[in-house]
Interface confidence: low
């Protein structure tokens, strides 16, 4: 069974998938549709890199632009470096400015909902 066939079988269960499963799926040529991606747990999506999301969505990655103001896409964008987002060529805005350091302060993030940034 290849990635696409596997994805069809598990699609209905994906809403609660942890980050590890999403990372694994991103390596399997599944081309997840945007409707499924939008139902994923925000906390599972946030740790994914731009490259992983690009692989996970395949051609559907273009849909991120249409969904950039909605969760989980909005929150995921806030966690990405802007120059990484720029590689998608979709004009996604709101990433971490170039030259900033991201401190993974879990308590700060839990309280504010955004990562802590240190300026250049």
């Amino acid at each position: 069974m290849n990635g696409s066939e596997y994805f069809v079988k598990i699609q209905s269960f994906l809403g609660g998938a942890p980050t590890e499963d999403l990372k694994a799926l991103s390596q399997q040529n599944v081309s997840m549709d945007l409707a499924t991606f939008m139902k994923l747990r925000t906390d599972a999506v946030l740790p994914l890199t731009v490259a992983e999301v690009q692989k996970l969505l395949g051609p559907h990655v273009e849909g991120l632009k249409a969904e950039e103001r909605h969760r989980p896409v909005r929150d995921w964008i806030l966690r990405q470096r802007q120059d990484d987002l720029d590689t998608l060529g979709l004009g996604l805005q709101g990433g971490i400015p170039n030259g900033y350091l991201v401190l993974d302060l879990s308590m700060q993030e839990a309280l504010s909902g955004t990562p802590c940034l240190l300026g250049p």
Epitope: S4, N29, A66
Partner: antibody, heavy 118, light 107 residues
């Protein structure tokens, strides 16, 4: 409502170039990628490529990478496709088509007919 | 490139009939397939996306099915306005590719 208005028919000589347009209305132009599709008379559809919403990124079908050049003008909500070094094989109807997030081509232009003839 | 094969170039039918158009992919696509209807001199119109989801405003007599490599478009109770050409399209991988089309004709 979403509308994609394409420019009129083109008659061109072999070796020449043509540039056609696709003017978008009824939605935020910079939100959706614009794709281009070729259809030769009595034949199927071929995907040429797309240009990103902001116009700074293009992806081409390898078959068309030396034939088509995609650009946009955000100020006029218009996408353009230029075809170069025309031959009779390029005689076709060319469609612009907007992707929709979950449906690939929900919206199409009416097509631009290109005829290459000596 | 993924090849989408519509083995029947033409299909004959009568008003009121049920007809099934088939499309076979050269590799598994999950459900990343759409179907379009095209009438002479017109742009294609999407009927089905994600293999089986009817697009807004499309009559219930159109139904899509299949996953993996084999896909179908079924029209029940064919109407005269359904006489057109039907194309399948995959959007699992670039380059996006279409079937060659199946033209529905009156018997």
């Amino acid at each position: 409502q979403v509308q994609l208005q394409q420019s009129g028919a083109e008659l061109a000589r072999p070796g020449a170039s043509v540039k056609m347009s696709c003017k978008a209305s009824g939605y935020t132009f910079t939100t959706y990628t614009m794709h281009w599709v070729k259809q030769r008379p009595g034949q199927g559809l071929e995907w040429i490529g797309y240009i990103s919403p902001t116009g700074d990124f293009t992806k081409y079908n390898q078959k068309f990478k030396d034939k088509a050049t995609l650009t946009t003008d955000k100020s006029s909500n218009t996408a353009f496709m230029q075809l170069s070094s025309l031959t009779s094989e390029d005689s076709a109807v060319y469609y612009c088509a907007r992707w929709n997030g979950t449906v690939w081509f929900a919206y199409w232009g009416q097509g631009t007919l290109v005829t290459v003839s000596a | 490139d993924i090849v989408m094969t519509q083995s029947q170039k033409f299909m004959s039918t009568s008003v009121g009939d049920r007809v099934t158009v088939t499309c076979k992919a050269s590799q598994a696509l999950g459900t990343n397939v759409a179907w379009y209807q095209q009438k002479p001199g017109q742009s294609p119109k999407v009927l089905i996306y994600s293999a089986s989801y009817r697009y807004s405003g499309v009559p219930y007599r159109f139904a899509g099915g299949g996953s993996g490599t084999d896909f179908t478009l079924t029209i029940t109770n064919v109407q005269s306005e359904d006489l057109a050409e039907y194309f399948c399209q995959q959007y699992n991988n670039y380059p996006l590719t279409f079937g060659a089309g199946t033209k529905l004709e009156l018997k």
